[in-house]
Interface confidence: medium
């Protein structure tokens, strides 16, 4: 239903908490520069607005589209050129262009210092001394850093810091309880990040009809009691809202998600008998326990898949009569059927269906042709399979930093062109994937394996866009989404790779590293040890091994040390001569 | 090309019954949800009642609940109302629905005349 004010509508849709939250991620999303202060004054002046929207819609400039408004706030900042260079160039675009524009400008990687957080007592003082300050600087710092973040539910992950925050601050050891706590919101909302953004690429990309067509595989697995109408009436909606949220129409795409969380807690009967817990909670919490809720009993009665896609005499008949809605049913069926695969899987499955339809409905015999289709996705099916039973056997092996070591030098190896800083951290994100999955029982495993992976992938497609280097990496990644992870795994040795001369500065360390903390540590490791790939593309997996043991002792020998700057300075080079002797 | 034939009304007296089907054919008649809907005379459509592809789940409207009952048989590709207790208020035309999007139904019959009346 059209409204005479949008903004309005939304503001009292929300409410004033979620709306104001919701602005300062948008600004935040938008200009990442700008500091807490400058954007706060901005919400405050669009949450008066849309006050005086809210008591009279007739009201000057309210029946402009919230696009405009944010857009006119952002383009009337002082010095917009100065900070932001081009992006200021926006500013002389009309809408929608204008918005099209800042899309365009949003920044994956921005340039700011990695988020710290404060010593628990002073977290604590600025928490009790001013809430809402406190949670608008977690939203306004994230929103930054992570420009397509799900903005619901980042408000999701305000309120969870906030309930941590006020249960915490009063026990007598702070820090016992918050750094647990708050690791743990922080490793949910970094993955959630990583996901979203992955959405983002994949609407961006490959349009609505993939991302929907991912949709009604996921919502298929969680809800396989529901009908296929019911499924497709889901994937729209999810569809709908995500696009929103990419697009940067955040007000409309937080409704939006509120309104189907309402839809399925009233059709719980239609959609699956696991919602009833979730339909208790309050909103932001309700659509969040929607969204990671675990998949109903699959019905004990299925039909074989065999019956409706390859058995029946109509197959052809009813593939030509309305293609997607075929497909779509096809995709229905088999993801209810396997909660098991990943939705990377289903879908190749489904393109893979789709490509033997199109190839034999034009031929002769079309059954003949098309009845050995469910057995020639046996390979498709074994592939992840086993990369799921290889990698988490290394990683049982190896533990999480071994494992990530292992993956780091693997990745070095197929793509040494990209930076060391951008490999180090794909690494390790993909080395997670270890203790994320690895510990799942059989049954979860590839889905939680593949489709974390297929994240991870995402993000450094993402970054390597930006400064494309590698040929391979532009390969894998131009591709369909679905073959990324596939593409990356089948990489081998890039051959081409001029390895990259030995710099005694690259490995050359102070006593400053004594007294990082651990994850920093390793980081510094993990950055040598892709230097030496980078040095050595084809060195084996004892001489590294040998090196990074080596320098392993030599750390921990100097941090022991007396005169640690000392130890650092005349044993240093002799770990080097011996590093370049051993990788010979 | 998509066809729902209705058949099975005429006139009843109150309290009497019937039995409506309805004929598809033109698309995998297993895979919808399908339902009937009424027109009374001078009176805007009211949802009567649907039933899921695989005939698990059904609604029906308050005015008709415990008195009317849809059912489908895949295999004849035929979806059924069977009504019972008629009353003068359920005179309409009923006609049969094909569904493509959960409650948002894409195809309709031509419609079958049910009259109660003394």
């Known amino acids: 239903e059209a409204h005479k004010s949008e903004i309005a509508h939304r503001f009292k849709d929300l409410g004033e908490q979620h709306f104001k939250g919701l602005v300062l991620i948008a600004f935040s999303q938008y200009l990442q520069k700008c500091p807490y202060e400058e954007h706060i004054k901005l919400v405050q002046e669009v949450t008066d607005f849309a006050k005086t929207c809210v008591a009279d819609e007739n009201a000057e400039n309210c029946d402009k589209s919230i696009h405009t408004l944010f857009g006119d706030k952002l383009c009337a900042i002082p010095k917009l050129r100065d900070n932001y260079g081009e992006l200021a160039d926006c500013c002389a675009k009309q809408e929608p262009e204008r918005n099209e524009c800042f899309l365009q400008h949003k920044d994956d990687n921005p340039n700011l210092p990695p988020f710290q957080r404060p010593e628990a007592e002073a977290m604590c003082t600025s928490f009790q001394e001013n809430p809402t300050s406190f949670l608008g600087h977690y939203l306004h710092e994230v929103a930054r850093r992570h420009p397509y973040f799900y903005a619901p539910e980042l408000l999701y992950y305000a309120e969870k810091y906030n309930e941590v925050l006020t249960q915490c601050c009063t026990e007598s050891d702070k820090a016992a309880c918050l750094t647990p706590k708050l690791d743990a919101v922080k490793e949910k909302a970094l993955v959630a990040a990583v996901r979203q953004r992955m959405k983002c690429s994949s609407m961006q990309r490959f349009g609505e009809r993939a991302f929907k067509a991912w949709a009604v595989a996921r919502m298929s697995q969680r809800f396989p009691n529901a009908e296929f109408a019911e499924i497709t009436k889901l994937a729209t909606d999810v569809t709908k809202i995500n696009k929103e949220c990419c697009h940067g129409d955040l007000l409309e795409c937080a409704d939006d998600r509120a309104e189907l969380a309402k839809y399925m807690c009233e059709n719980q009967a239609t959609i699956s008998s696991k919602l009833q817990a979730c339909c208790d909670k309050p909103v932001l919490q309700k659509s969040q326990c929607l969204a990671e809720i675990e998949h109903d009993n699959i019905p004990a009665d299925l039909p074989s898949i065999a019956a409706d896609f390859v058995e029946d005499k109509e197959v052809c008949k009813n593939y030509a009569e309305a293609k997607d809605v075929f497909l779509g049913t096809f995709l229905y069926e088999y993801s209810r059927r396997h909660p098991d695969y990943s939705v990377s899987l289903l879908l190749r499955l489904a393109k893979k269906y789709e490509a033997t339809l199109e190839k034999c409905c034009a031929e002769g015999d079309p059954p003949a042709c098309y009845g050995t289709v469910l057995a020639e996705f046996q390979p498709l099916v074994e592939e992840p399979k086993n990369l799921v039973k290889t990698n988490c056997e290394l990683y049982e092996k190896l533990g999480e930093y071994g494992f990530q070591n292992a993956v780091l030098v693997r990745y070095t190896q197929k793509a040494p062109q990209v930076s060391t800083p951008t490999l180090v951290e794909a690494a390790r994100n993909l080395g997670r994937v270890g203790t994320k999955c690895c510990t799942l029982p059989e049954a979860q495993r590839l889905p939680c394996v593949e489709d974390y992976l297929s994240a991870i992938l995402n993000r450094l497609c993402v970054l390597h866009e930006k400064t494309p280097v590698s040929e391979k990496v532009t390969k894998c990644c131009s591709g369909s989404l679905v073959e990324r992870r596939p593409c990356f795994s089948a990489l081998t040795v890039d051959e081409t790779y001029v390895p990259k001369e030995f710099k005694a500065e690259t490995f050359t360390f102070h006593s400053d590293i004594c007294t990082l903390p651990d994850k920093e540590k390793q980081i510094k490791k993990q950055t040598a040890l892709a230097e030496l790939v980078k040095h050595k593309p084809k060195a084996t997996e004892d001489q590294l091994k040998t090196v990074m043991g080596d320098f392993a002792q030599f750390v921990d020998k100097c941090c022991k040390a007396a005169d640690k700057d000392n130890c650092f300075a005349t044993e240093g080079p002799n770990l080097v001569a011996r590093s370049k002797e051993a990788l010979a | 090309e998509v066809q729902l034939l209705e058949s099975g009304g005429g006139l009843v007296q109150p309290g009497g019954s019937l039995r409506l089907s309805c004929t598809a054919s033109?698309?995998?008649?297993?895979?919808?949800?399908m339902g009937w809907v009424r027109q009374a005379p001078g009176k805007g459509l009211e949802w009567v009642s649907w039933i899921r592809p695989d005939g698990t789940f059904t609604y029906y409207a308050d005015s008709v609940k415990g008195r009317f009952t849809i059912s489908r048989d895949n295999s004849k590709n035929t979806l059924y109302l069977q009504m019972n207790s008629l009353r003068a208020e359920d005179t309409a035309v009923y006609y049969c629905?094909?569904?493509?999007?959960?409650?948002?139904?894409?195809?309709w019959g031509q419609g079958t005349l049910v009259t109660v009346s003394s």
């Open positions: 033109g698309f995998t008649f297993r895979h919808y949800r």
């Open positions: 629905a094909k569904s493509y999007h959960a409650d948002k139904f894409d195809y």
